[in-house]
């Protein structure tokens, strides 16, 4: 009886199992019982990344500089181009089709993880004993100054946004 299913890297057509085209090649004509599947390499700036029976290769992704994109990894006949964002920007999605400016962490917040071309800045509130008085995409929370270590006393308590203010110890005490 004619086959109803085929092995891996084959496909069923006209009651017959034909070889799929390897990655980097497209289908020109199906096999017959006398000749194998005819495949052709993808052209320049095209790719196919799986064993396939596609009659057209996919175009490589274009990393549009007008959208803040640049090429991270050039595509081959078997892989798509990988885009990333220019310095100071990150992708808006996993597909990285456009970029936005990295967010800054407001005063009272520090940078937990610096942004990359594909991920935004991650901020965290400054815990007790730490502060940040600037809006920054790089600065972590800084520890309050230890007045004690400087033989000074705390004139003003620190907050998440301000450092402590130290002053000379009151000699009358």
């Amino acid at each position: 009886e004619p086959p109803t299913a085929c092995r891996e890297k084959q496909y069923l057509i006209n009651s017959q199992c034909c070889s799929l085209c390897q990655p980097g090649q497209k289908l020109v004509s199906d096999c017959t019982e006398f000749t194998e599947t005819e495949c052709l390499p993808c052209g320049e700036s095209e790719f196919l990344d799986t064993w396939n029976r596609e009659t057209h290769c996919h175009q490589h992704k274009y990393c549009d500089p007008n959208l803040g994109l640049r090429v991270q990894q050039k595509g081959t006949s078997e892989t798509d181009t990988i885009c990333t964002c220019e310095e100071g920007w990150h992708c808006t999605s996993e597909a990285c089709e456009s970029c936005v400016l990295h967010r800054s962490c407001s005063p009272g917040f520090g940078v937990k993880q610096i942004a990359t071309g594909v991920s935004d800045t991650i901020c965290e509130p400054c815990p007790v004993g730490f502060f940040s008085n600037v809006s920054s995409a790089f600065e972590k929370c800084h520890p309050w100054t230890s007045c004690e270590d400087k033989n000074l006393e705390v004139l003003q308590k620190g907050t998440s946004q301000t450092n402590v203010i130290c002053g000379p110890q009151d000699r009358l005490r």
Partner: antibody
């Protein structure tokens, strides 16, 4: 034992017709693709035509397209080649062959077709 | 159609010799190549399929190699019964086509 026996060859005038037969035995005929291959006197092999199993597609060399017709009768275990508008260059020994995995593993003994006036 | 070119066209060798016949395709055919042996007045016989696989019942002194456009048939130690004509045949594109043949004669 697999056997293929061609018949129907002979002398024919240019423009004439001939029908070759190939009687198959010793295997499940309907399960195999079959083909005709010819060999002009003192020359090499030329693939002429093929027919898929289970009444599959038919395929021809450009040199015979439109003039030759391949067919099969699975109930009679027989392969045919109808040859019309014959030319001197069709003179050859015609072999029928069984196909398996893109190769011809069994061949008949051949039948001679001579096209001459 | 794909052209298959065999070399040499004829070859003289002695029993026990190692012999190599080459076959070149006019375009890439991957490993889609068969080799046949034909003796005078007889039908061809399949020796090698898919460029390098030995057909059942064929002696192991026959071997095939190659892919793309260049292929070889090697007989490691010629036996008297090996003197014949050898043909390559591609099945990468329709229609299947044969090389012109290599006649192996006794020296």
């Amino acid at each position: 034992e697999v056997q293929l026996l061609e018949s129907g060859g002979g002398l024919v005038q240019p423009g004439g017709s001939l029908r070759l037969s190939c009687a198959a035995s010793g295997f499940t005929f309907s399960s195999y693709a079959m083909s005709w291959v010819r060999q002009a006197p003192g020359k090499g092999l030329e693939w002429v035509s093929g027919i898929g199993s289970y009444g599959g597609g038919t395929y021809y060399a450009d040199s015979v397209k439109g003039r030759f017709t391949i067919s099969r009768d699975n109930s009679k275990n027989t392969l045919y080649l109808q040859m019309n508008s014959l030319r001197a260059e069709d003179t050859a020994v015609y072999y029928c062959a069984r196909y398996v995995n893109f190769g011809m593993d069994y061949w008949g003994q051949g039948t001679l077709v001579t096209v001459s006036s | 159609d794909i052209q298959m070119t065999q070399s040499p066209s004829s070859l003289s060798a002695s029993v026990g010799d190692r012999v190599t016949i080459t076959c070149r395709a006019s375009q890439s055919i991957s490993s889609y190549l068969n080799w046949y042996q034909q003796k005078p007045g007889k039908a061809p016989k399949l020796l090698i399929y898919a460029a390098s696989s030995l057909q059942s019942g064929v002696p192991s002194r026959f071997s095939g190699s190659g892919s793309g456009t260049d292929f070889t048939l090697t007989i490691s130690s010629l036996q008297p019964e090996d003197f014949a004509t050898y043909y390559c045949q591609q099945y990468g594109r329709n229609p299947p086509t044969f090389g012109q043949g290599t006649k192996l004669e006794i020296k």
